[in-house]
Interface confidence: low
């Protein structure tokens, strides 16, 4: 046997090259036949009325033919025949790859609530062979469940991803990525998650700056509440007591002028949105006013006083009002 061919894999719509090669040629006639065993080329003559076949090279040692605009119906075995004695025959198999026609991602709902499990589906239509679908949430790969539907040698793959969403997922892309031999580079589609989440509440002491609260001083606390949707309600309350009469509430700010010991206690900022409620507590302790030492008459003494400030904030970042997660910073 001195007639050789190579199998060809081609993407639909592109060009396939079929080559019949002869070792130790004796100038025998070479013929190329299609899967229906119709003659495409007999030597350098094309009897077949399909102008997509064009002669690239003809010699005693090679018949090389191109087939343009390949379609799936062109797939199959092509026969090279060498009219030696006895005749020799070899075949090449053309495999046609069809990239997915369309890549669709479908998300169960436009807006999800943190903790909710949502379904995301991605469909790669009409490919050959079947497409492999990979899921990513941002840069993290996730596991989906795929179903393959076959119709007329073509495959439609649908991958289902069940995704439990968290607040950190808001604005993160969910990416459906296709892997297919007919696709070079990344073929992907993505949707951005929109996640609603309960408020996160933080209290910041904006005055006094050094954090030590003494009798007669003023106190200013600012409540920062971040959530989605942005909290509509941010309120200050005093836990287990009335708010001091001299306290002034202005939006997220709490002002208490002329602090005294009766102001000691826990001040709570509460925030809520449609997802849930959260609060943060500030424990106020009012220290004695600084004592002034009269200067001695004969000697000068420098006294250095070191003060330790204790700032305690108790935060509850859970939805609902019962219980608390206590984080104490010294």
């Amino acid at each position: 046997q001195n007639l050789f061919t190579k199998d060809v894999t081609v993407i639909e719509g592109e060009v396939a090259t079929i080559s019949c090669q002869v070792n130790k040629s004796d100038d025998s006639v070479i013929q190329l036949l299609n899967p229906n065993r119709q003659t495409i080329y007999f030597r350098d003559f094309r009897p077949l009325k399909d102008s997509r076949f064009q002669l690239l090279n003809f010699s005693s040692s090679e018949l090389k033919v191109s087939l343009t605009n390949v379609s799936i119906s062109d797939e199959g075995r092509y026969f090279c025949q060498l009219y030696t004695d006895p005749p020799q025959e070899s075949y090449t198999t053309i495999t046609v790859l069809v990239p997915p026609r369309n890549l669709m991602i479908d998300i169960q709902k436009d807006t999800a609530v943190e903790g909710e499990e949502i379904e995301v589906n991605c469909t790669a239509m009409a490919s050959k062979p079947a497409t492999t679908i990979r899921w990513f949430k941002g840069n993290t790969e996730l596991k989906g469940k795929s179903e393959v539907e076959e119709w007329s040698d073509m495959y439609t793959v649908t991958s289902q991803l069940m995704l439990k969403v968290h607040k950190e997922d808001d604005g993160v892309p969910v990416i459906c990525q296709v892997e297919h031999p007919a696709v070079t580079g990344n073929l992907q589609t993505q949707r951005y998650l929109e996640v609603q989440y309960k408020p996160q509440v933080h209290i910041q002491m904006t005055y006094p700056l050094q954090g030590l609260t003494r009798e007669g001083d003023a106190l200013e606390l600012t409540c920062e509440a971040i959530g989605k949707p942005q909290p509509v309600m941010v309120t200050w309350v005093r836990v287990d007591d009335e708010m001091p009469q001299h306290a002034v509430l202005s939006g997220p700010n709490l002002f208490i002028n002329n602090l005294n010991k009766t102001d000691n206690g826990t001040y709570r900022c509460e925030a809520s949105n449609i997802v849930g409620k959260a609060h943060s507590d500030y424990m106020l302790y009012v220290y004695d006013p600084p004592t002034t030492i009269p200067p001695p008459t004969t000697t000068t003494t420098t006294t250095t006083t070191t003060t330790t400030t204790i700032l305690t904030i108790i935060t509850d970042s859970r939805a609902g009002e019962e219980g608390s997660i206590r984080a104490v910073d010294h």
Epitope: N102, D110, G138, D170, G171, P173, Q190, Y192
Partner: antibody, heavy 115, light 107 residues
Framework: QVQLQQWGAGLLKPSETLSLTCAVY????????WGWIRQPPGKGLEWIGE???????NYNPSLKSRVTISVDTPKNQFSLKLSSVTAADTAVYYC?????????WGQGTLVTVSS | SSELTQDPAVSVALGQTVRITCQGD??????ASWYQQKPGQAPVLVIY???NRPSGIPDRFSGSSSGNTASLTITGAQAEDEADYYC??????????FGGGTKLTVL
């Protein structure tokens, strides 16, 4: 409330490189794509490309050979460079938070290419 | 050439209803987003997703979709609605695409 502020040279000569920067204020920078869109005078909007905080980019195929979008995550900034500009690149350039739909947008910078 | 097609201009009488359409293959799979742009200003998102309005957008703006066509409807058009409107989506490669824009005149 996310706000985008952009700046860069407004007048260029042909063959020079357009350079714009956009700063993001008041919102999360990670987890989003950040993009550039342009609008020639009296014409429609054309997407240029986008980048995420980790530097992964997508470009408009028609501009890909001339475009570089980069990111400075610590500064919450991203930048556009468009090389070998011609008069056809004269446009208002907008930065925007990317996604399925770009929103919000920067104020826009008119870049004029003229010899 | 844009992969999303819009009528260049549409007019509406004050207080009447107007529909602006956008066509494209990608819209068989995806919803369109819609932007309003007034002279000298950046575009403003008015509709996204199935029919979602960002805060501050009047409820006279609504969106719908059928087949490869997306529509923006303004019910009871006001003088301040006179602007250019752009639709937007992504193509099968994940690239952002915009329609050519529709100039709305309120008579």
């Amino acid at each position: 409330q996310v706000q985008l502020q952009q700046w860069g040279a407004g007048l260029l000569k042909p063959s020079e490189t357009l350079s714009l920067t956009c700063a993001v204020y008041g919102g999360s920078f990670g987890g989003y794509y950040w993009g550039w869109i342009r609008q020639p005078p009296g014409k429609g909007l054309e997407w240029i490309g986008e980048i995420n905080h980790s530097g992964s980019t997508n470009y408009n195929p028609s501009l890909k050979s001339r475009v570089t979008i980069s990111v400075d995550t610590p500064k919450n900034q991203f930048s556009l460079k468009l090389s070998s500009v011609t008069a056809a690149d004269t446009a208002v350039y907008y930065c925007a938070r990317g996604g399925w739909y770009p929103d919000p947008w920067g104020q826009g910078t008119l870049v004029t290419v003229s010899s | 050439s844009s992969e999303l097609t819009q009528d260049p201009a549409v007019s509406v009488a004050l207080g009447q209803t107007v529909r602006i359409t956008c066509q494209g293959d990608s819209l068989r799979s995806y919803y369109a987003s819609w932007y309003q742009q007034k002279p000298g200003q950046a575009p403003v998102l008015v509709i996204y997703g199935k029919n979602n309005r960002p805060s501050g957008i009047p409820d006279r703006f609504s969106g719908s979709s059928s087949g490869n066509t997306a529509s923006l409807t303004i019910t009871g058009a006001q003088a301040e609605d006179e602007a250019d409107y752009y639709c937007n989506s992504r193509d099968s490669s994940g690239n952002v695409v915009f329609g050519g824009g529709t100039k709305l005149t309120v008579l």
